[in-house]
């Protein structure tokens, strides 16, 4: 028996359902009574879901997995993972045994888009050219860790005096806070771009300082 899985990682958004595709080619006369299908975590061999001894043995993984029972006899051994969490990320092995056996691994990459950044200024009043100002760009609830880029109004990257921190919350999602310290010119726009490297999604925020008032 030959097992086939997708070579590319499966990308799944947090809180959505993902399908880890796996298939095999059943011989003529194949019956489910002959099938041993096991999905397990590749590294630890911890059981995720199995169909053995003629029946679906159920989910051993947070009760969030399911097979496609009507498609098994056609060789579709795919696994549905519901309400994906950050902790689901990793490699899963699809193990199929009929008379002989084969297995293959598929990677699950979890992602969550970052929110539109909010911009704050410190100090936020009585600003004069030549003042040192701290601009903070905050974006929330993304995964994996973001890449943060700062640019001025002319699109020139600002790399000096940037401090970025990323903190994971209890769900494993990251809140990003990036701080830019600059000396104000006569006027200027400062843009922050928060990129999710897996989704290739960019979230933009900017602040324009034109004497007073400030525009965000």
């Amino acid at each position: 028996v030959e097992v086939q899985v997708s070579e590319d990682p499966v990308v799944a958004l947090v809180d959505t359902d993902a399908t880890l595709r796996c298939s095999f080619s059943p011989e003529p006369g194949f019956s489910l009574a002959q099938l041993n299908l096991i999905w397990q975590l590749t590294d630890t061999k911890q059981l995720v879901h199995s169909f053995t001894e003629g029946r679906d043995q159920g989910s051993a993984y947070s009760n969030r997995t399911a097979l496609f029972p009507d498609l098994l006899v056609q060789g579709n051994a795919s696994l549905r993972l519901q309400r994906v969490r950050v902790t689901d990320e990793g490699s899963y092995t699809c193990f199929v045994s009929i008379q002989d056996f084969d297995s293959a691994a598929v990677s699950l990459q979890v992602a969550a888009p970052y929110s539109k950044p909010s911009m704050t200024l410190e100090p936020n009043k009585d600003l004069r050219p030549g003042n040192m100002v701290t601009i903070t760009c905050s974006s929330y609830q993304g995964y994996p860790e973001a890449e943060v880029f700062w640019k001025d109004g002319q699109g020139v990257p600002l790399t000096g005096n940037v401090t970025t921190s990323q903190m994971a919350n209890e769900r494993g999602l990251f809140d990003v806070h990036s701080v830019l310290r600059v000396v104000l010119g006569a006027n200027g726009t400062y843009s922050c771009l928060v990129r999710n490297p897996v989704l290739q999604q960019d979230a933009h925020g900017s602040v324009t300082i034109t004497g007073q008032p400030l525009t965000f």
Epitope: N36, I38, Q40, K45, Q46, L47, S50, T52, E53, R55, Q57, G58, S59, A60, N63, T93, F95, S97, F101, S103
Partner: antibody
Amino acid sequence: QVQLQQPGAELVKPGASVKLSCKASGYTFTSYWMHWVKQRPGQGLEWIGMIHPNSGSTNYNEKFKSKATLTVDKSSSTAYMQLSSLTSEDSAVYYCARGGYFDYWGQGTTLTVSS
Amino acid sequence: DIVMTQSQKFMSTSVGDRVSVTCKASQNVGTNVAWYQQKPGQSPKALIYSASYRYSGVPDRFTGSGSGTDFTLTISNVQSEDLAEYFCQQYNSYPYTFGGGTKLEIK
């Protein structure tokens, strides 16, 4: 006929580890899950976990995750359960049982933890 | 975890009688229930799977019934060799769990 052979008894000291065996015969060892079950004297049965000999896949009762480690040796059709950091609470009869329906059971190994 | 409750720890019956051992699951387990017989000093022996299916070699005086949360093992025409403890078990979800057992005494 299906047989699951287990040693009758093991005596070990507190803090030590022990590896219990279950030798299967009379069926295709790699086609069935092997389960392990604990029974303390005069008490009920507790499911420890299971292992599939062909894939090596394991599933543990959370209660025993840090206590038991299940392995198999396909060449000798033998399943093993290692119990670590033993205390008197681990003194019990330990059974292996075949398959999703626990249709055949070993005779059990009586584990005594005592100094 | 699903709790399997066998409320009667002991049951007394006579040879030839009919006796029913009951088991209640704390949540719906469908028909994914098995019954085991354990005689003194022996390992458990499988009697019933999928709530009502008898293993080959098990006398037909043993009958299983029920679904959802309530299950019964009925022994009709009780024999002296039926002196044993009887356990129910759910295998609907992990961890698999057993009832506390019901000891059958023959008067």
